[in-house]
Amino acid sequence: APTSSSTKKTQLQLEHLLLDLQMILNGINNYKNPKLTRMLTFKFYMPKKATELRHLQCLEEELKPLEEVLNLAQSKSFHLRDTKDLISNINVIVLELKGSETTLMCEYADETATIVEFLNRWITFCQSIISTLT
């Protein structure tokens, strides 16, 4: 059974992940991003179901494509903090949260999504799990 300290740790990790995802979304979905039109042409796979921490496997599998699209966006007038570090940090948190005991085969929805829809889906996921923990 999860202890209160492990629940607190999970909550903090989810909050960290949430902030990172919100930072990326705010960093690309704004009036100062000259590459938004181009970025929205890239398609991301969405989870068919995302209700438990183990479903973060689906996010992990899309982190590489996410990094590639964010690299595309870097320009003089637009920058997120170092993309590689950011994605690496997210990856570490995701691995810790989903656990490595069981490897889940991720089931994806039929329809792909834009980067905005993708990020927002995982932001919603984090908010949902956090609310069940609190």
């Epitope: 705010n26 009036y31 829809e117 908010q127």
Partner: antibody, heavy 122, light 107 residues
Framework: QVQLVESGGGVVQPGRSLRLSCAAS????????MHWVRQAPGKGLEWVAV????????FYVDSVKGRFTISRDNSKNTLYLQMNSLRAEDTAVYYC???????????????WGQGTTVTVSS | DIQMTQSPSSVSASVGDRVTITCRAS??????LVWYQQKPGKPPKLLIY???SLQNGVPSRFSGSGSGTDFTLTISSLQTEDFATYYC?????????FGPGTKVEVK
């Protein structure tokens, strides 16, 4: 004070063109993305188009894609909406609007013009 | 495209009443939601941004709440000048979309 004034509306036949203008004053126009929003008689609001501060991005509602073009001239502090192949369903009051933030989308649109009326009728 | 729905479509109320308008998005939009007030023959007026932040100059009787798909605009004590139509709007992804509006009229 911050102000937006639309012009260029009028009565036009289906299939014809019209160009709307929006003159901005009281703020640094070249720093802001700008929007067009319309409202058909007795109906709700419909977002039409947006253009980035530097013109680098433009987005449109599906119903006007390929027919309407949003543009701007920062040296003249003016926003435009070129409307081609007009249809009866384009009849509406057209508002230009400035975002509440020059960065974040979720600050909405805090400055609106009084609107210019476009009537498409034969 | 993200669809926005509002309920009720109209509400009859009296001065001093508490009025609640709900807005629902067809998919989660976090807090990327805005509320406007519009009076006949006038352009819309921004009331609430980012789902719950009150725009400068807007009376504190207006408040917004919600996140994800369900949002609420509350007028705590209706005043004469509040009789108008209220619209919610999502600002997450283009095309931006508005709800159909809720008309607040005199009872």
């Amino acid at each position: 004070q911050v102000q937006l004034v639309e012009s260029g509306g009028g009565v036009v036949q289906p299939g014809r063109s019209l160009r709307l203008s929006c003159a901005a004053s009281g703020f640094t126009f070249s720093s802001y993305g700008m929007h067009w929003v319309r409202q058909a008689p007795g109906k709700g609001l419909e977002w039409v188009a947006v253009i980035w501060y530097d013109g680098s991005n433009k987005f449109y509602v599906d119903s006007v894609k390929g027919r309407f073009t949003i543009s701007r001239d920062n040296s003249k502090n003016t926003l435009y909406l070129q409307m081609n192949s007009l249809r009866a369903e384009d009849t509406a009051v057209y508002y230009c609007a400035r975002p509440g933030s020059d960065y974040y989308f979720y600050y909405g649109m805090d400055v609106w013009g009084q609107g210019t009326t476009v009537t498409v009728s034969s | 495209d993200i669809q926005m729905t509002q309920s009720p479509s109209s509400v009859s109320a009296s001065v001093g009443d508490r009025v609640t308008i709900t807005c629902r998005a067809s998919q989660g939009i976090s807090n990327w939601l805005v509320w406007y007030q519009q009076k006949p023959g006038k352009p819309p007026k921004l009331l609430i941004y980012a789902a719950s932040s009150l725009q400068n100059g807007v009376p504190s009787r207006f408040s917004g709440s919600g996140s994800g798909t369900d949002f609420t605009l509350t007028i705590s004590s209706l005043q004469t000048e509040d009789f108008a139509t209220y619209y919610c709007q999502q600002a997450l992804s283009f095309p931006w979309t508005f709800g159909p509006g809720t008309k607040v009229e005199v009872k």
